[in-house]
Each structure stands twice: as C-alpha cells, then as structure tokens.
C-alpha cells in the first residue's frame, strides 16, 4: 500500500501526480478518496 506520508514526501512530484497515484491505488484497494 502507498501511504499518504510516502506520497506527500515524494519530492519533485506535482500535486496532480500525487492525486494520480492515490486514485490508481483507490481503484485497486477501494479506499475512500475523501
């Protein structure tokens, strides 16, 4: 699983790229995105 902490501290990523990775993970894990 990709944690929010990991993603928010992944330097050089755009905000959309973080949302993109969250959403791809959400489609697999069905974790609520709110």
């Amino acid at each position: 699983a990709v944690s929010e902490h990991q993603l928010l501290h992944d330097k050089g990523k755009s905000i959309q790229d973080l949302r993109r990775r969250f959403f791809l993970h959400h489609l697999i894990a069905e974790i609520h995105t709110a």
Epitope: G12, K13, S14, I15, Q16, D17, R19, R20, F22, F23, L24, H25, H26, L27, I28, A29, E30, T33, A34
Partner: antibody, heavy 118, light 116 residues
Framework: QVQLVESGGGVVQPGRSLRLSCAAS????????MSWVRQAPGKGLEWVAT????????YYPDSVKGRFTISRDNSKNTLYLQMNSLRAEDTAVYYC???????????WGQGTLVTVSS | QLVLTQSPSASASLGASVKLTCTLS???????IEWYQQQPEKGPRYVMD???????STGDGIPDRFSGSSSGAERYLTISSLQSEDEADYYC?????????????FGGGTKLTVLG
C-alpha cells in the same frame, strides 16, 4: 498474458439499449480497476467509464452520465457496459482497458463496433 | 479546463528519429501524461507515462527506441531508429480527480508516417 475480448456490438436504433461485455483472462480480474474507452469512426479516443476493482466506485464523463452504466462480475471475469438512450454520436468502436498500479489504461482489447442508426 | 494539443501529422524517414509533441493547457503544465500508440486497424497500446521532470516508465513490450522528455507544458515522445511498424496514430492522455470525480481526456492524436 493479459487478454481482453470485447463483444456485444452491433447496429441499434436511436433511443434503444445495448450491453457490451469484456471477457478478461491472464490476470486476477478482481484486483484491478477497469475502463471503457471509445473511438468514433476516423476520430480520436474518448474515455467513457471506469470502475474500481470490487465495483463499489464508478466514474463517467458528462457525455454519457445517466445513460451508460459500467459494472463487473468478478466471478465471471467479465466487465460490462450498459448503454441506454443511444444516440447517433455514440457510434464508435468500444474498447475495454485494464489499469496497473502505475497507469490507467495499460492493457487494451481489440474493440467492438457499435453503430447507432435508424 | 484540461486540454491536450497535438499536431495532426508528422513524418520522418526509415531509420531516422522523430519527436512528437503534446502540449498541456498552461494551468496544467506540471501534469503527468500518458502516451498511446494505435497501429492501423488495431486497438490502442500503452507506450509510457511521462512526468513533468521528464522521467517515464514504459509499457510491456515497448522497445527502448521510445523515450520521453518534458519542457514546461510540453511533453515529448521521441522514437529513434524508426521502423515501418512505428507508422501509427499517437495519442497523449491525462487524468485528474476533482472533488472525487475522475476526468480523463485525450489529445486529438498525431498520425506518424514513416517514409521509406
């Protein structure tokens, strides 16, 4: 290897309904989000619908929202697209696509043609 | 709104290189995009995703002749040592989630002709 085979296309009159199917094999179907993307004759690609791995979440563009419904049967390894109130502008080849952890449409089927005409 | 712009056509000679461009709407210049290839009479094929810093990861079976780069709002797909099978339509695409709604848009596509 990943295989996606669409079926159910054909000629249908405006205002009528049609259901497309996508049979998946070569991977654990229930572990991935799936999508439908269409391509009108001689035109570009248009995203149509996306569904999460277990079917709990669905997403549509405004162009089909309220008319099209994406669903899945994980016990049958099959993805569906129920298309109601069809219009001439829905005429297209419809492709199903599978996501990966890295991207939305990593694997594609060969498509099925839907023609809406009176 | 989220828009991707591509030149309708491009051409290059067999064995040469070609650079295809996909331009994001200015307010979306940091976005990660995807590139797809569609050979004549076939379904699309995922080529790569391409980030704002030029880093990219390619799809299954994509040869290393295909590479990506970025500059500002522009995203490039470079194909080197062109082969006849590279003649295809190339589409870029981009997705985003806004208020728990997903949106995905494609560019209009570039038709690549390989001159032989």
């Amino acid at each position: 290897q990943v295989q996606l085979v669409e079926s159910g296309g054909g000629v249908v009159q405006p205002g009528r309904s049609l259901r497309l199917s996508c049979a998946a094999s070569g991977f654990t179907f229930s572990s991935y989000g799936m999508s439908w993307v269409r391509q009108a004759p001689g035109k570009g690609l248009e995203w149509v619908a996306t569904i999460s791995s277990g079917g709990s979440y669905t997403y549509y563009p405004d162009s089909v929202k309220g008319r099209f419904t994406i669903s899945r049967d994980n016990s049958k390894n099959t993805l569906y697209l129920q298309m109601n109130s069809l219009r001439a502008e829905d005429t297209a080849v419809y492709y199903c696509a599978r996501q990966t952890t890295m991207t939305y449409f990593a694997y594609w089927g060969q498509g099925t043609l839907v023609t809406v005409s009176s | 709104q989220l828009v991707l712009t591509q030149s309708p056509s491009a051409s290059a000679s067999l064995g040469a290189s070609v650079k295809l461009t996909c331009t994001l709407s200015s307010q979306h210049s940091t976005y990660t995009i995807e590139w797809y290839q569609q050979q004549p009479e076939k379904g699309p094929r995922y080529v790569m995703d391409l980030k704002q810093d030029g880093s990219h990861s390619t799809g299954d079976g994509i040869p290393d002749r295909f590479s990506g780069s970025s500059s500002g709002a522009e995203r490039y797909l470079t194909i080197s040592s062109l082969q006849s099978e590279d003649e295809a339509d190339y589409y870029c695409g981009v997705g985003d989630t806004i208020k728990e709604q997903f949106v995905y848009v494609f560019g209009g596509g570039t038709k690549l002709t390989v001159l032989g």
